[in-house]
């Protein structure tokens, strides 16, 4: 469940957007005679978000340095350029970190953080769920089914609702609730399954309305270099909260001597940084996609935008090969644990497990791996990138493909390595989950590249979607499911079921190639989905009659 | 009708084994947590031993004071509970009772909704 | 492991009268407490589940009530056929146990 909305919603903050502001910017300025006195006055003092076309262009993965010529803009409004364009036009430099806007920018990757901690914390604790509520295999599957279509389905309408109303009280609201929510399931009775299910998709509504508004507050208070690094910051919180969710559920449990504490910890937490959110993060007017102006907004329509987004090949198969992502983080995420477990009962290095919970120390170390593989494979993934983009213009596809089908090998190992090494097994782990998640950054800054700015915030909550519906939505009840089946047709011995289990998650390196496959053909459309995309925006740099999506 | 109906009770010597064995009607065996509770004369109920469905691994639990010594298995296919009693003690000396767990397709519960007629168990030398 | 007590060991009662049957649990245990009747040579059978839920064929006259430590088993005006020993089962961890239980007789 290691998904990407967080780092697709980051991609609103893409260069072609900044350059494509300051553009209208300065020819607004041009048509109203000389100044730019106009330039930034709409946003006021509060301007941080207009950004800058100029100084260094910084992706996830690079950047392109432009000589400065000029002096930065007024100091009162920072990031604001100057009107004149042309070759020697004043370019801004990109606004200082303030302590206030940096303040903002680590609470709500903090609450990034606690998103992603109490999402993991529950599958710290699942065997130990399982256990009270007497849940059977077909309803823990159902207990993180639930959690993800609910979030898959609010995602959308958070992105809807975060373009046009107040975003840091939605957001604070959003945390309010799911802190409330998952306190009050820590004390559900025994007899009620149902709302224990209910509550986590509650959980999933209300930790959508995050996911999906927090990286666009980010994108609003910072210039381009800044804002990339705090962006990176905010994806860095995905790997960080899900490891720490394992970690806090097992060691929760074990101090407490009861599991339901570990469902107590992020509300708490949460608590506090929906407070410091209401408190410290300023009330930011929207970012660039609100300069284009009524008439832009008028002529482009959510089913044209839609359809827009369809034919954009590059798109499509990006989000496709993002499904693939999310449907083997997801399935892998619930069921290694169970399965080294397994797989150290059949070399008898370990008793069967007769009293859950059953790999408790397997989930501790697979949380620490995850932990520190998102963090390389991020830092990995970009590092790729900068290096391939001299020698290709598709390297940002190119690179995530090689991934994918790298980190499908090692997962195919892990399965071979796992009948006679656990160590063995975690390695294959660990150099899988770095590849599989070195693409996170790339992703965002492909969709960046090939998708419009008055076309993101739909292109990123479509992206959340699709890669929910067709990846951890439902990849952790298939493979029970197909675990369940091949054990039916067995004799009951450990030996089965650590093979069926191993049999079922040998889909995941399938899927993983098959994502692979949708990054290359990513590759193939990329240049021209690129150029189309800047050919584009260019068009709405022109006089609005000219103007055409 | 739910029916459970237990066999293989006897007479025993001290370390010897003995197979109690459930059959079965009247509900889907398959889905549905079984257990083992016994009651030696005289006195109250205690909990020996539960297994789940084969879809949650067959999963056994088991009383601290058996643990080691007896094991719960069951065959779908004959909708029978069995509890295989080795290294008997006098004091395992009781009524052993077929229970069956509520089934809530999703989730069972853990106490015990009809119950065997039961069968003696004597371990004395 | 979680203990249960029940009080009192031994309960006398004239037919009609209404009784309180106590149990205490060594934790709090939510409601996560059953009740069970066994008559004389009998097999025990299932009274009231998650301390207050009834059970389809039990007379009304059984209720139950209670969460945390300390639930009651209430039968309103006795009958003779309710003089038998009543058992609670605590479900909220494992091993799952019973208290040693209250037995009704006739005064």
């Known amino acids: 469940m290691m998904c990407l909305e967080c780092a697709s919603a980051a991609a609103g903050g893409a260069e072609e957007e900044e350059a494509d502001a300051e553009r209208r910017r300065r020819r607004r300025g041009a048509q109203r005679g000389a100044g730019g006195s106009g330039c930034c006055g709409a946003r006021g003092a509060g301007g941080a978000g207009v950004s800058a076309a100029g100084d260094e262009v910084q992706t996830l993965s690079g950047s392109v340095r432009r000589a400065p010529t000029g002096p930065p803009g007024t100091p009162g409004t920072p990031g604001c350029a100057a009107t004149a364009k042309g070759p020697g036009a004043q370019q801004p430099k990109p606004a200082s970190l303030g302590r206030g806007r940096g303040a903002a920018a680590a609470i709500l990757s903090l609450g990034n953080v606690l998103n992603y901690l109490d999402r993991y914390t529950v599958a710290g604790v699942l065997l130990d769920i399982q256990q009270h509520f007497g849940v059977k295999a077909r309803g823990a599957g159902l207990l993180q089914s639930v959690f993800i279509c609910s979030f898959m389905v609010a995602a959308p309408i958070f992105g809807y609702l975060g373009d046009r109303f107040n975003r840091k009280v939605i957001l604070s609201c959003g945390i309010f609730f799911w802190s409330a929510v998952t306190f009050s399931s820590s004390f559900i009775p025994q007899q009620y399954f149902w709302l224990l299910v209910l509550s986590r998709g509650l959980v999933g509504i209300g930790e959508a309305s995050y996911s999906t508004i927090a990286p666009t507050i980010i994108g609003d208070l910072f210039t381009k270099n800044t804002r990339t690094l705090m962006l990176s910051v905010f994806y860095f919180a995905i790997p960080l909260g899900s490891g720490l969710g394992y970690i806090t559920g097992s060691s929760v449990k074990q101090a407490a001597g009861d599991w339901h504490w570990a469902l107590r910890v992020s509300p708490v937490l949460g608590m506090i940084t929906g407070t410091l959110i209401l408190i410290l993060v300023p009330a930011t007017k929207r970012g660039h996609a609100d300069q284009l102006g009524d008439q832009l907004k008028a002529r482009t329509s959510w089913l044209r935008d839609m359809k827009a987004l369809i034919r954009n090949r590059s798109y499509v198969f990006s989000s496709l090969a993002t499904s693939a992502v999310s449907f083997a983080t997801g399935a892998l995420g619930m069921w290694i644990p169970l399965y080294l477990h397994r797989a150290q009962v059949v070399q008898k290095t370990a008793e069967t497990c007769n009293s859950p919970p059953c790999g408790a120390k397997d989930s501790l170390i697979f949380g620490a791996i995850t932990c520190f593989t998102g963090f390389l494979g991020v830092v990995t993934g970009a590092g790729a990138t900068r290096w391939c983009r001299l020698k290709t213009q598709r390297a940002d596809p190119l690179v995530c493909a090689v991934g994918m089908l790298g980190s499908a090998i090692f997962i195919c190992l892990i399965f071979v390595a796992a009948k006679s090494s656990i160590v063995g097994a975690y390695i294959c782990i660990f150099v899988g989950e770095t590849l599989l998640f070195s693409n996170w950054a790339i992703t965002a800054d492909i969709l960046m590249y090939v998708v419009i700015p008055t076309r993101r915030a739909t292109a990123v909550a479509l992206q959340s979607f699709t890669s929910h519906l067709l990846g951890d939505a439902g990849s952790p009840y298939l493979i029970g499911f197909i675990s369940d089946l091949i054990r039916q047709s067995t004799k009951d011995s450990p030996l089965w079921e650590f093979l069926s289990l191993g049999y079922a998650l040998m889909l995941c390196p399938f899927v993983v190639v098959l994502g692979g496959m949708f990054f290359l053909a990513t590759a193939l459309f990329f240049v021209s989905d690129r150029a189309r995309a800047e050919q584009q925006v260019n068009q709405l740099a022109m006089p609005p009659a000219s103007v055409k999506v | 009708e739910v029916q459970l109906v237990e066999t293989g009770g006897g007479l025993v010597r001290p370390g010897s084994s003995l197979k109690l064995s459930c059959a079965t009607s009247?509900?889907?065996?398959?889905?549905?947590?079984m257990s083992w509770v016994r009651q030696a004369p005289g006195k109250g109920l205690e909990w020996v031993a539960l297994i789940k469905d084969k879809n949650s691994n067959s999963e056994a639990n088991y009383a601290e004071s058996i643990k080691g010594r007896f094991t719960i298995s069951r065959d779908d296919s004959k909708s029978r509970v069995y509890l295989q009693m080795n290294t008997l003690r006098d004091q395992d000396t009781a009524t052993y009772y077929c229970?069956?767990?509520?089934?809530?397709?999703?989730?069972?519960?853990?106490?015990?909704?009809?119950w065997g007629q039961g069968v003696m168990v004597t371990v004395s030398s | 492991d979680i203990v249960l007590t029940q009080s009192p060991p031994t309960l006398s009662v004239t037919p009609g009268e209404s009784v309180s049957l106590s149990c205490r649990a060594s934790?709090?245990?939510?409601?996560?407490i059953h009740w069970y009747q066994q008559r004389s040579n009998e097999s025990p059978r299932l009274l009231i589940k998650y301390a207050s839920q009834s059970i389809a064929g039990i007379p009304s006259r059984f209720s139950g009530s209670g969460s945390g430590t300390d639930f009651i088993l209430s039968i309103n005006r006795v009958e003779s056929e309710d003089f038998s020993v009543y058992y609670c089962?605590?479900?909220?961890?494992?091993?799952?146990?019973f208290g040693p239980g209250t037995k009704l007789e006739v005064k």
């Open positions: 089962q605590q479900t909220y961890s494992l091993p799952l146990t």
């Open positions: 934790q709090g245990i939510s409601t996560s």
């Open positions: 009247g509900f889907t065996f398959s889905d549905t947590w």
């Open positions: 229970t069956r767990h509520e089934d809530f397709y999703y989730y069972s519960g853990y106490y015990f909704d009809y």
